[in-house]
């Protein structure tokens, strides 16, 4: 009774196709296939950055896949053949692993790359990313920032950068077609006369840090004698309704304060005869339907009424 | 597997210069940088400077007045030169390859002494 | 420059003890640029550590690294006599890149 065995994969290798992390991960079959011609070989793929506790793993027929990584880091990868069980008679052979690494070569100490990046997605509209200077590079020192998501033939440089004394330190970005809901990749690197520039990459999605405007036309309504319905409207844009959260600030006669989150544009409130003032803000953010995270906008323009009894009309500013 | 490799003269004078080849085997220095680090009964560890791969070089502030560094990538050899050598550069003087922000290999070291 | 201030300078510790090094930085150090490497006489340093807890390949699970900011360590849980060497902190954050005095840890 010969033992069955099936060789690795040929010509595993990890390409770069200029994704700023986008990578391809490919194979051949192995050799000595023949025995095997009625069966479908499949194979397990194991990837990962290098310093990551986890592999990921994915079980497939093809000769290829393709994923996202961090190109700070290397990236280690392994794959090996895989017979069913059907084509064996018996337990699933598996063969032995093949290996590849895959690594953007450094130039420049750590700490001459962008410090402190923020990007943030306006109003789900308008990218914007801003960083600083690395530390103790010279004022020659110029960064460049360049893009790819899923859409487009190639990585883009920033053609409107923001600039201080000179130097590059943010982007503002174009109209960025289809692009949320997918990996957005950035590369920031830089040049100097001095010294080497540390590139930097950074991958989000764009859904994630949107900081919407703040809502519009607050408005009071009188429920009852002792509920007072406040009321706005969402931002303009083109964030539809069902994917805000909103946060509230009311002032009762400049000393009670409530704070409430809600997922609607109404909020009623109990209030006594005796108010004489009454101002709320509010605030919005993307919420979990539509988004991971996101960041509050800013307050809205403060609503009050006073001087008159609340309980005697609706209030309109 | 990987292996660096360093040689050097061993006893040099004072006020002149030391220069140590670093030889590399089992990886190529045109993916990988390379420092040189030293290590002295008064100072310990020191980072002397690196040759990143594209060959652009980085030095320790205290050094570069005095000290290069460069490479021929078609031999895989990176050189290390100091000038105006004193006593007290006497030290073990090592090559170790750049991985992950890391030193993860180092050659064995070449002592250099500095005597008259 | 980031001073990296070693604790103890020498250690002398019995088979089986848990033992722990700590390395003190003059300013933070992100925890990916902190490493530590161990030393024999006649070797060369080993890179024994990196990215301040994860263990270097072939090194024993008896070994960790932890720490943020200024403050790292490395332990020993029950020492072997094979750990006997000097074991450097390493910070690859800021030009200069420097080294902790390194610790020499004996075995009673």
């Known amino acids: 009774d010969t033992e069955i065995k099936v060789n690795p994969p040929q010509d595993f290798e990890i390409v770069d196709p200029g994704y700023l992390g986008y990578l391809y991960l490919q194979w051949q079959p192995p050799l000595s296939l023949d025995h095997f011609k009625e069966c479908t070989v499949e194979y397990e793929l194991k990837y990962r950055n290098i310093g990551s506790e986890t592999w990921k793993t994915i079980i497939t027929k093809n000769l290829h896949y393709k994923d996202g990584f961090d190109l700070n880091k290397g990236i280690e990868a392994k794959i090996h053949t895989l017979l069913p069980w059907q084509c064996t008679n018996g337990s699933e052979v598996q063969s032995s692993w093949a290996e590849t690494t895959y690594w953007i070569s450094p130039q420049g100490i750590p700490e001459t790359k962008v410090q402190d990046m923020d990007c943030v997605y306006y109003n789900w509209q308008y990218l914007l990313c801003s960083w600083k200077p690395g530390i103790g590079v010279l004022l020659d020192t110029n960064y460049n920032l360049f893009y790819w998501y899923e859409g487009l033939d190639h990585a883009l440089q920033c053609v409107d950068y923001i600039k201080a004394d000179g130097q590059n330190i943010g982007c503002r970005f174009p109209y960025l077609e289809a692009s949320d809901y997918k990996d957005f990749y950035i590369c920031v690197n830089g040049s100097s006369e001095n010294k080497p520039i540390r590139s930097s990459y950074f991958t989000f999605q764009l859904q994630n840090i949107v900081k919407p405007l703040p809502p519009v036309y607050l408005t009071f309504t009188r429920e009852s004698s002792c509920e007072i319905k406040l009321k706005w409207s969402i931002p303009l844009g083109p964030i539809p309704a069902r994917c805000f959260d909103y946060e509230i600030e009311i002032r009762e006669d400049d000393t009670t304060l409530v704070t409430a989150t809600v997922e609607n544009e109404t909020y009623t409130l109990k209030t006594t005869n005796e108010t004489r003032q009454l101002c709320f803000v509010v605030r919005s953010k993307v919420n979990i339907y539509c988004s991971d995270d996101g960041i509050w906008s800013e307050w809205s323009d403060k609503q009050c009424w006073e001087g008159e009894d609340l309980s005697k009309k609706t209030l309109l500013r | 597997q990987v292996q660096l490799q360093e040689s050097g003269p061993g006893l040099v004078k004072p006020e002149t210069s030391l220069s140590i080849t670093c030889t590399v085997s089992g990886f190529s220095i045109t993916k990988y940088g390379v420092h040189w680090v030293r290590l002295s009964p008064g100072k310990g560890l020191e980072w002397l400077g690196v040759?990143?791969?594209?060959?652009?070089?980085d030095y320790n502030a205290a050094f570069i007045s005095r000290v290069n560094i460069s490479k021929d990538n078609s031999k895989n050899q990176v050189f290390f030169k100091m000038n105006s050598l004193q006593a007290n550069d006497t030290a073990v003087y090592y090559c170790?390859?750049?991985?992950?922000?890391?030193?993860?290999?180092w050659g064995q070291g070449t002592t250099v002494t500095v005597s008259s | 420059e980031i001073v990296l201030t070693q604790s103890p300078s020498i250690l002398s510790a019995s088979v089986g003890e848990d033992v722990t090094i700590t390395c003190t930085a003059s300013?933070?150090?992100?925890?990916?640029?902190l490493h530590w490497y161990q030393q024999k006489p006649g070797s060369a340093p080993k890179l024994w550590i990196y990215?301040?807890?994860n263990l270097a390949s072939g090194v024993p699970s008896r070994f960790s690294g932890s720490g943020s900011g200024t403050s790292f360590t490395l332990t020993i849980s029950s020492l072997q006599a094979e750990d006997a060497a000097t074991y450097y902190c390493h910070q690859y954050h800021r030009s200069p890149l420097t080294f902790g005095a390194g610790t020499k840890l004996e075995i009673k």
């Open positions: 040759i990143w791969s594209g060959g652009s070089t």
């Open positions: 170790a390859r750049d991985f992950g922000d890391t030193m993860d290999y």
């Open positions: 300013s933070s150090v992100t925890s990916s640029y």
């Open positions: 990215s301040t807890s």
